[in-house]
């Protein structure tokens, strides 16, 4: 429950939230579990802690490992663990299962595909969407806030959808991609 799997691609931004939630006023300390070394909070570091968030800007394969977050209230300390895996970018179009977020289902009347983890990032529209690595074009596809809406959904719309956006941190831009499967169900 208080250990969460997170994954990302090398050279992309990855932001992880401490799985142990606390009130906004509580302080959070992050450590690299294997060495018990404290993660710095200074933003000049490629990997730094920012309250509930641990930021990899950008991520490297060597960043993989378990990170400990300790949330401190005035009287209680509670621990969470983030199990982070950074993968090398695939040269082909295939997105392996281990990079996939949860599958979503849609129907003719309801076909929203939410871009996974996007709420953790400082991004601005537009959000780019791809299906099986092809950029989506045509009036049936509408990128709305953090969703893709597909009009008049057909069974052929099933497949793997990737959202791509830019995270901005202190004027620097970092790419982020996330992929999930979409299935079409009968009404």
């Amino acid at each position: 429950k208080f250990s969460k799997q997170s994954w990302g691609l090398e050279n992309e931004a990855l932001i992880v939230r401490c799985p142990r939630q606390g009130k906004p006023s509580y302080t959070v300390d992050w450590y690299y579990s294997q060495t018990n070394k404290s993660i710095p909070t200074q933003e000049r570091n490629r990997v730094f802690a920012s309250g509930q968030l641990l930021k990899f800007l950008p991520a490297r394969v060597a960043d993989s490992g378990i990170y400990t977050c300790i949330v401190r209230s005035p009287t209680f300390n509670r621990t969470g663990y983030a199990n982070v895996t950074i993968y090398k970018k695939q040269s082909d179009c295939n997105v392996p299962d281990y990079l996939m977020y949860s599958t979503v289902s849609g129907s003719e009347k309801n076909s929203k595909i939410y871009c996974p983890t996007i709420d953790l990032y400082n991004w601005t529209a537009p959000l780019e969407w791809f299906k099986n690595c092809q950029a989506l074009q045509g009036s049936r596809y509408r990128a709305h806030k953090s969703f893709l809406v597909i009009d008049n959904v057909m069974t052929e719309d099933a497949g793997d959808y990737t959202c791509k956006f830019i995270h901005n941190e202190n004027g620097a831009n970092y790419s982020v991609t996330a992929t999930r499967s979409f299935t079409v169900k009968d009404e």
């Epitope: 429950k1 208080f2 009130k23 509670r78």
Partner: antibody
């Protein structure tokens, strides 16, 4: 210093009503979830009801659902339990307590408790 | 609802002895388990949270362990003031539930 002080207990007939109050001091009442727990004479502890901080979402034990209502007045730093259709099995010491941590959708321990107020339901 | 079963119901020990109290959950509560101490005529007092962390001001002789469904509260060397009733409580989900209590009494 955190303090919780219950009041409003007493003797009531079956089917009657009672309103318990819990006056809180020594902490920022509005941001904490608050809980009522009861203890029948010589028995163990039973969670009765919880209320979120500023959001105000409420939760009830099945044994009191539809009969008891938990509420709070953050401007008065006071927690309430309105008890209707009281039964003999509601006889207990009622404690109010503070959840010092919980975030939306989660619960935590009870770090401060009042001294309790006795409710006796008997004809 | 998650049922917590404490054992034994009563533990008769002498001061200085080690007390081991058990709490078993009907389904996994991860580490969302607390222990309380209650003395006659008093409100419960929080001892342990998240299965193994001592609350502020609780002496080191109290320790908690376990995860999932099986938990233990250990008092390494009983002091006279430790004779009381001890309750476990889960907070992974509503309804919050307590065990029926273990009474630690003087032998």
């Amino acid at each position: 210093e955190v303090q919780l002080l219950e009041s409003g207990g007493g003797l009531v007939q079956p089917g009657g009503s009672l309103r318990l109050s819990c006056a809180a001091s020594g902490f920022t009442f509005s941001i904490y979830d608050m809980i009522w727990v009861r203890q029948a004479p010589g028995k163990g502890l039973e969670w009765v009801s919880s209320i979120r901080g500023e959001g105000g979402g409420t939760y009830y034990a099945d044994s009191v659902k539809g009969r008891f209502t938990i509420s709070r007045d953050n401007s008065k730093n006071t927690l309430y339990l309105q008890m209707n259709s009281l039964r003999a099995e509601d006889t207990a010491v009622y404690y109010c307590a503070r959840d010092p941590w919980s975030t939306e959708g989660s619960f935590f321990v009870l770090d401060y408790w009042g001294q309790g107020t006795l409710v006796t339901v008997s004809s | 609802e998650i049922v917590l079963t404490q054992s034994p119901a009563t533990l008769s020990l002498s001061p200085g002895e080690r007390a081991t109290l058990s709490c078993r959950a009907s389904q996994s509560v991860d580490d969302d388990l607390a222990w309380y101490q209650q003395k006659p005529g008093q409100a419960p007092r929080l001892l342990i949270y998240d299965a193994s962390n001592r609350a502020t001001g609780i002496p080191a002789r109290f320790s908690g362990s376990g995860s999932g469904t099986d938990f233990t509260l250990t008092i390494s060397s009983l002091e006279p003031e430790d004779f009381a009733v001890y309750y476990c409580q889960q907070y992974i989900t509503a309804p919050l539930t307590f065990g029926q209590g273990t009474k630690v009494e003087i032998k």
